[in-house]
Amino acid sequence: ECRPGMICATSATNSCARCVPYPICAAETVTKPQDMAEKDTTFEAPPLGTQPDCNPTPENGEAPASTSPTQSLLVDSQASKTLPIPTSAPVALSSTGK
């Protein structure tokens, strides 16, 4: 199993062959310190890779690394924009699996 903050990018039937950092960081609210702005507090999504959940170090999952060249996950152009904060909480989903 990949570490938290990682995702399996290549997998066999029952195991992960290659873990990569999960490429989408969850947006969080960031507020200005109280002494900087009392009324004009702003809320911004953090830059990519700044959260513990988005470890930028490649190939550091617990699963064995693949010997083949790795395919990097690329960020679309939308990612550079300031993004709205999602209002819905993460949803844990269950599956019967295979």
Epitope: S11, C16, P86, S88, V91, L93, K98
Partner: nanobody, 122 residues
Framework: EVQLVESGGGSVQAGGSLRLSCTAS????????MAWYRQAPGNACELVSI???????YYTDSVKGRFTISRDNAKNTVFLYLNSLQPEDTAVYYC????????????????WGPGTQVTVSS
């Protein structure tokens, strides 16, 4: 139990296009990220693309600039537009819900739906 139904696959010539759809039921669709994975015969299951709840999109480099992922939360559907298809894109395509949670453990192809076959001939 989460249920997903993938559709839109088919057989096309190289350079052709397809639109894949993944319709979800039994969970709140606008919450989690959604991902597309694919698996060619005899090959591993590989991550293709992810779309976040707020619309940010990510692609593996082999499909960057050719594939586009989008979602319609009102219709509980996520789409994958496949353009400039190549024979190496031939695979069964699967969508996966909330990959941040569900695809850490490994195999993420076919756990939630039957997939849809894409065949690209040269």
């Amino acid at each position: 139990e989460v249920q997903l139904v993938e559709s839109g696959g088919g057989s096309v010539q190289a350079g052709g296009s397809l639109r894949l759809s993944c319709t979800a039921s039994r969970f709140t669709f606008d919450g989690p990220d959604m991902a597309w994975y694919r698996q060619a015969p005899g090959n591993a299951c590989e991550l293709v693309s992810i779309i976040s709840a707020d619309g940010r999109t990510y692609y593996t480099d082999s499909v960057k600039g050719r594939f586009t992922i989008s979602r319609d939360n009102a219709k509980n559907t996520v789409f994958l537009y496949l353009n400039s298809l190549q024979p190496e894109d031939t695979a069964v395509y699967y969508c996966a819900p909330d990959p941040r949670r569900n695809c850490r453990g490994g195999y993420c192809c076919g756990n939630w739906g039957p997939g849809t076959q894409v065949t690209v001939s040269s």
